[in-house]
């Protein structure tokens, strides 16, 4: 997913956990794949900045070459810049690792604007700050990008963390979390805690925050309060879901359940902003308005192209209104929310108003490409990637940043009546039209 | 059509208080599409926005008089005023209301203004 | 806190001729801008908005054009009500709060 929003960041920032630590409740949920508890050895591993995108450090090759790779569980490839570029500090040498193996094939990945092009091979991959293996893996090696990289946001590749199916050139292009549970005894499952700002940055704070954790082959308990609930996978793919029900402070839509995941609902980290289909965000919109009518925002604002600025420490959070998406759950008829404030909604935007002043962007925008749980989304939540159980698990994240007043939330059971009426089913066609944009 | 007007005292005594009120005529000050805004001028210099107001009563200042302005809007009378306290000589400008249209933007209507003098 | 910067300070044409102006922000600002026209003793006017959008009533001959940080209004043919101090705005942050320093065309 390309964040921008679909970044690459498509629009949220590292930050230290930040916020209060919410009583823990019990668990109630089944036993879970993989090693529970602590990951000590992966807290903490991801950095980022606002809209740019969180990014894990790699090493390929051999010997060794670090590279920061941005973790996007909106699309399949690995992909590493592989030649100079004005915005790479560094780039993956093939020339330089005895372990590389040529794959004689060229990838062209095209995005709504941009593009990245590359040559296929394999090599030996780890991550340092992850679990103590190596895999080969299949790295595209980007020769040629437009509008892919970005200026200072510190990575220098992509991590596609979603299904064969949407890989690039084709679904016979084993992608690395598959290669990586293939080759070694890691249980199938990986999760992330993604740690918004809350407040603009500096570039040095910002280079040298930590923006969250990416636990592969299981669940951390350290990193989320409450009790996990899951939505399943309808379709591997994307990390696609569905939405049931959509609230604005508590007020329902009441929309046709069709048009909240018209045409697919994902999760994606690759991407900066919550995206909602047209019609939903128009409604969506009018509603966030109303309950923010004491006072007026400019129209650039909503279409999260103008800031808007307050005194610095005066942002008056309590006339925005919360957002709760309604996700189908494990057992027929019950579904659950997830709730997020608008201190993940309204993103930080560091170096354009004065000291004095803190100013945010809207983080909500108008897909044509369907529902896009963005960073906005999972900055509030730890968000369980369960492919062995073909589920999705949120929990209310450690580190999510919030007032006194109000928290995001997870919350369930409800019961809801035909949730599989909500999916909507994509025309097949005998071409492939995979978009991959994600602006 | 619309027009605005600044009223008030030409001249206020330093560490005084400036006091000045728009009159909005031809439409309303409740309307949901706009805000209304002071900005000053002082002689031979630029524009300098004070701060901006909604119907509701919700305020926009300018970090740097935030500490002295208040602005406040009366509906019953059309009307929103500006107080800025604890003037000196350094406050001597050309004071002007203007509407803030074009998506909540821009100062698309403005008064003839009104020069206040700070002396003693 | 974003700066905008416009040069010359001030122009000297004859009536007739093409003015240009120009207007630089400190960093991007999109095409969040605008341009005031401000006569002696006058109130400034609103003339172009959102960079290229000419306001209600203004003449043709006024125009906007760029984005990002650089930004121009052009006058294509100077007539005599012209000569006035011009200013740019961005609203980018809002509330509006941040002006130009102005450009003043005079008459040659």
């Known amino acids: 997913t390309h964040l921008g929003i679909r970044l690459p960041l498509r629009s949220g920032l590292a930050g230290p956990p930040l916020g209060l630590r919410l009583p823990r409740e019990t668990d109630e949920e089944s036993e879970e794949p993989g090693r529970r508890g602590s990951f000590v050895e992966m807290v903490d591993n991801l950095r980022g900045k606002s809209g740019q995108g969180y990014y894990v450090e790699m090493t390929v090759g051999s010997p060794p070459q670090t590279l920061n790779i941005l973790v996007d569980t909106g699309s399949s490839n690995f992909a590493v810049g592989a030649a100079p570029h004005p915005f790479l500090h560094r780039y993956y040498q093939r020339q330089l690792s005895s372990t590389y193996r040529d794959l004689r094939k060229g990838v062209y990945v095209p995005y709504t604007q941009g593009k990245w092009e590359g040559e296929l091979g394999t090599d030996l991959v780890s991550i340092p700050h992850g679990p103590n293996v190596t895999v080969r893996a299949n790295i595209a090696a980007i020769t040629e990008s437009d509008k892919f990289f970005i200026n200072g946001s510190n990575w220098e590749g992509i991590l596609g963390l979603a299904y064969a199916e949407i890989a690039r050139p084709d679904d016979s292009l084993e992608p690395f979390f598959d290669s990586l549970v293939k080759q070694t005894h890691i249980p199938n499952i990986f999760s992330l805690q993604l740690c918004g700002a809350g407040f603009p940055l500096n570039q040095t704070e910002a280079l040298a925050s930590v923006g969250g954790s990416m636990i592969i082959g299981g669940i951390d308990h350290s990193l989320y309060t409450g009790r996990l609930w899951y939505t399943p996978i309808r379709r591997e793919w994307y990390y696609e879901v569905i939405i049931v029900r959509v609230e604005i402070n508590g007020q329902d839509l009441k929309m046709d359940c069709k048009e909240y995941n018209y045409d697919k609902s994902i999760v994606d980290s690759g991407t900066t902003n919550l995206r909602l289909p047209k019609k939903v965000f128009e409604a969506a919109v009018k509603s966030i308005k109303a309950a923010s009518s004491t006072e007026k925002f400019p129209d650039g604002f909503w279409l999260g192209e103008q800031l808007v600025c307050w005194q610095a420490g005066t942002t008056p959070w309590n006339i925005f209104p919360v957002i709760s998406l309604y996700l189908m759950g494990e057992v027929t008829n019950q579904s659950f929310r997830i709730t997020i404030l608008p201190q993940q909604y309204l993103r930080p935007v560091e170096d354009v108003a004065t000291s004095q002043d803190d100013c945010y962007k809207f983080a909500v925008s108008q897909s044509s490409t369907g529902t896009v749980m963005g960073a906005v989304i999972m900055e509030g939540f730890y968000v369980v990637f369960d492919r062995a159980r073909k589920r999705i698990g949120f929990a209310v994240s450690a580190c999510h940043v919030h007032d006194e007043f109000r928290t995001a939330a997870v919350e369930g059971p409800f019961v809801t009546a035909d949730m599989e009426d909500c999916g909507y089913n994509i025309p097949q066609t005998d071409e492939s039209t995979l978009m991959t944009g994600r602006a | 059509q619309l027009q605005l007007q600044e009223s008030g005292p030409g001249l206020v005594k330093p560490s005084e208080t400036l006091s000045l009120t728009c009159t909005v005529s031809g439409g309303s000050i409740s309307s949901s599409s706009y805000y209304w805004g002071w900005i000053r001028q002082p002689p031979g210099k630029g524009l300098e926005w004070i701060g901006s107001i909604y119907y509701s009563g919700s305020t926009y200042y300018n970090p740097s008089l935030k500490s002295r302005v208040t602005i406040s809007v009366d509906t019953s009378k059309n009307q929103f005023s500006l107080k800025l306290s604890s003037v000196t000589a350094a406050d001597t400008a050309v004071y002007y209301c203007?509407?803030?249209?074009?998506?909540?933007?821009?100062?698309?209507?403005w008064g003839r203004g009104t020069l206040v003098t700070v002396s003693s | 806190e974003i700066v905008l910067t416009q040069s010359p300070a001030t122009l000297s044409l004859s009536p007739g001729e093409r003015a240009t102006l120009s207007c630089r922000a400190s960093?991007?600002?999109?095409?969040?801008l605008a341009w005031y026209q401000q006569k002696p003793g006058q109130a400034p006017r609103l003339l172009i908005y959102d960079a290229s959008k000419r306001a209600t009533g203004i003449p043709a001959r006024f125009s906007g054009s760029g984005s990002g940080t650089d930004f121009t209004l052009t006058i294509s043919s100077l007539e005599p009500e012209d000569f006035a101090v011009y200013y740019c705005q961005q609203v980018y942050t809002w509330p509006p709060r941040t002006f130009g320093g102005g450009t003043k065309v005079e008459i040659k």
């Open positions: 203007a509407r803030v249209g074009h998506g909540i933007s821009y100062f698309d209507l």
């Open positions: 960093q991007s600002v999109s095409s969040y």
